[in-house]
Interface confidence: medium
């Protein structure tokens, strides 16, 4: 009986849970695109339950298909500032190991200061999720503006 | 057996399954920028499963991480509308109880009519989701157009 | 014992993992308005696992509530292009049976070149859904730009 | 037409806890869609948020005073309190209460009481 | 915390003069900003909110503008009773916080 019972909790181990949501940290040096994340619950309401963060560039733990979000907000912007600085675009993608390099979303703010987006992708343990943001407006730190996470779906 | 065969049901009811999906019933009286909610299957594709509305705002009832998000389109609107009634700005966070008030998600329109986002974050039964939109222009109430919802994610 | 065992697989079979993520294959002939999608792992990160492919457009396999999220992206586009060629608007909907047609998510393009959005939807098996983009624009095939998913999230 | 009057000894010695009362007519502390706030401001300085609370006794604090500072409610007799423990000269300032109209993102202020001065001085 | 900064820290003006206040936030606050004016020895009075809604009682004279981290208070024609402090304050992110103050004085 105690063995049906220990069994039959497997399903919910093997459904993974793997979460994770960052808020932006920082922006890097001249010369890398990248944005910088961080997450905790000393922080806010960012997390991670399985996922990793190397570098402020988020490592996923688990094999599986995940739904990957991010919203990010220029900081100093109206819609003429958006337009006058175009192309401002971001793209997240698996930036390591090298081998499976990809864009996997990208959008451009043409005249809008804020794009949000999801997408369900296959993920493997290791891969390095980075995101780029391209053009010379800075992004917003507010925790309601700028996100990004993932979130394990199926095997 | 039948002590296993109830037992291995836990997993299922531990997932928690809570998950709404709103449409639009009406805005606020002057000076209340809330969007005020419905759900149901009898007003078309909106449901409740687990979340209860409160005076057209959605409480939560099970702890956890969730998945909200939101699409608003503005009523008659324009690029040009929406650029001369700037600022019109959504925003989505916990409204009740008071100590747990936080802003989760928040969005301008700026030259567009149509907002759309998501993201995860740890809600507590109990928590009320208000979603306020300032400004003067008013929210289509077009079931495909302007919807709200959340998704229980994990424990 | 090992009907316990066996028994206590069913929550995780019940879940349905029922998912599926799409690339464009390409735009209708005219007065066809629909986009035709295709998937699967010989052409990168697109899958279909549940789902079926029915001429370019998705058909659901289980009942369910599910997860629909679209990103658009216009081919050749500048916030100038997008409002000369307003209105430019994206309609996912099930298009079959008839008995079912209905219209789940609507967005214009207005100034910008990429729509996003998602919602939750109660979904019956043989469902179709269609995509249709309305305009003279067309859309990017860029599998970073252009997607289309459904993921199952409750019974 | 809301009014709100402050309450309370005008002077307090270092160390001690500042008490004050702020007595709302022609409204109702009870109100769905009000935050009640307590604001300072030092002689000839600028304004300081302290926190506010909600008629179901949910508060929310400045986190640079939280550790000294409680906000209460009294829907019966429609009065809201501050307390601000271990007073420092620094603490001197007018203490004003007043009504906070927004939501979860924060709120401004619509109504005001005339403002207290209560100094710190042993 | 957001830090507003405001400028210039006195304007001397004369009545019948057009007046314009700036406010700074060290980072987006949307349009959750709010004005309020006071005058010696009286609390402060809410003039405007969500940068460019006038509260009830305001007179059109005076009017926001602005949104992100810039905005602006205008007040069209100045009247001898507009002489007084001007604060601007936002509700973006806790805690709220008030700028430091932009005197308008009789020149």
């Known amino acids: 009986q105690r063995f049906a019972q220990a069994q039959q909790q497997l399903p919910l181990e093997s459904l993974g849970w793997d979460v994770a949501e960052l808020q932006l940290n920082h922006t890097g040096p001249q010369q890398d695109p990248r944005l910088y994340w961080q997450g905790g619950p000393a922080l806010g309401r960012s997390f991670l339950h399985g996922p990793e963060l190397d570098k402020g560039q988020l490592r996923i733990h688990r094999d599986g298909i995940y739904m990957v979000h991010i919203q990010v907000t220029l900081a100093i912007c109206s819609s003429t500032t958006a337009s006058r600085h175009h192309p401002t675009t971001l793209a997240v993608g698996i930036c390591s190991p090298a081998s499976r390099s990809i864009s996997l979303l990208r959008l451009s703010f043409h005249q809008g200061c804020t794009i949000a987006s999801q997408r369900l992708t296959p993920l493997a343990r290791g891969d390095t999720l980075c995101t780029n943001l391209t053009g010379t407006l800075l992004p917003s730190r507010n925790t309601d503006e700028t996100f990004f996470g993932v979130q394990w779906v199926r095997p | 057996q039948r002590f296993a065969q109830a037992q291995q049901q836990l997993p299922l009811e531990s997932l928690g399954w809570d998950v709404a999906e709103l449409q639009l019933n009406h805005t606020g009286p002057q000076q209340d920028p809330r969007l005020y909610w419905q759900g149901g299957p009898a007003l078309g594709r909106s449901f409740l499963h687990g979340p209860e509305l409160d005076k057209g705002q959605l409480r939560i009832h099970r702890d956890g991480i969730y998945m909200v998000h939101i699409q608003v389109t503005l009523a008659i609107c324009s690029s040009t509308t929406a650029s001369r009634h700037h600022p019109t700005t959504l925003a989505v966070g916990i409204c009740s109880p008071a100590s747990r008030s936080i802003s989760l998600l928040r969005l301008s329109f700026h030259q567009g009519c149509t907002i759309a986002s998501q993201r995860l974050t740890p809600l507590a039964r109990g928590d009320t989701l208000c979603t306020n939109l300032t400004g003067t222009l008013l929210p289509s109430r077009n079931t495909d157009e302007t919807f709200f919802g959340v998704q229980w994610v994990r424990p | 014992q090992r009907f316990a065992q066996a028994q206590q697989q069913l929550p995780l079979e019940s879940l349905g993992w029922d998912v599926a993520e799409l690339q464009l294959n390409h735009t209708g002939p005219q007065q066809d308005p629909r986009l035709y999608w295709q998937g699967g792992p010989a052409l990168g990160r697109s899958f279909l696992h549940g789902p079926e492919l029915d001429k370019g457009q998705l058909r659901i396999h289980r009942d369910g509530i599910y997860m629909v999220h679209i990103q658009v992206t216009l081919a050749i586009c500048s916030s100038t292009t997008a409002s000369r060629h307003h209105p430019t608007t994206l309609a996912v909907g099930i298009c079959s049976p008839a008995s079912r047609s209905i219209s789940l998510l609507r967005l214009s393009f207005h100034q910008g070149c990429t729509i996003a959005s998602q919602r939750l939807t109660p979904l019956a098996r043989g469902d179709t859904l269609c995509t249709n983009l309305t305009g003279t624009l067309l859309p990017s095939r860029n599998t970073d730009e252009t997607f289309f998913g459904v993921q199952w999230v409750r019974p | 037409q809301v009014q709100l009057q402050e309450s309370g000894p005008g002077l307090v010695k270092p160390s001690e806890t500042l008490s004050l009362t702020c007595t709302v007519s022609g409204g109702s502390v009870s109100s769905d869609y009000y935050y009640w706030s307590w604001i300072r401001q030092p002689p000839g300085k600028g304004l300081e948020w302290l926190g506010y609370?909600?008629?179901?006794?949910?508060?929310n604090y400045n986190p640079s005073l939280k550790s000294r500072v409680t906000i209460s409610v009294d829907t019966s007799k429609n009065q809201f309190s501050l307390k601000l423990r271990s007073v420092t000269t620094a603490d001197t300032a007018v203490y004003y209460c007043a009504r906070g109209d927004g939501d979860f993102l924060g709120v401004c202020f619509d109504y005001w009481g005339q403002g207290t001065l209560v100094t710190v001085s042993s | 915390e957001i830090v507003l900064t405001q400028s210039p820290a006195t304007l001397s003006l004369s009545p019948g003069e057009r007046a314009t206040l700036s406010c700074r936030a060290s980072q987006s606050v949307s349009s959750y900003l709010a004005w309020y004016q006071q005058k010696p020895g009286q609390a402060p009075r809410l003039l405007i909110f969500d940068a460019s809604n006038r509260a009830t009682g305001i007179p059109a004279r005076f009017s926001g503008s602005g949104s992100g981290t810039d905005f602006t208070l205008t007040i069209s024609s100045l009247e001898p009773e507009d002489f007084a402090v001007y604060y601007c304050?936002?509700?973006?992110?806790?805690?709220?916080?008030f700028g430091g103050g932009t005197k308008v004085e009789i020149k």
């Open positions: 304050q936002q509700r973006s992110n806790w805690p709220l916080t």
């Open positions: 609370i909600y008629y179901s006794g949910s508060t």
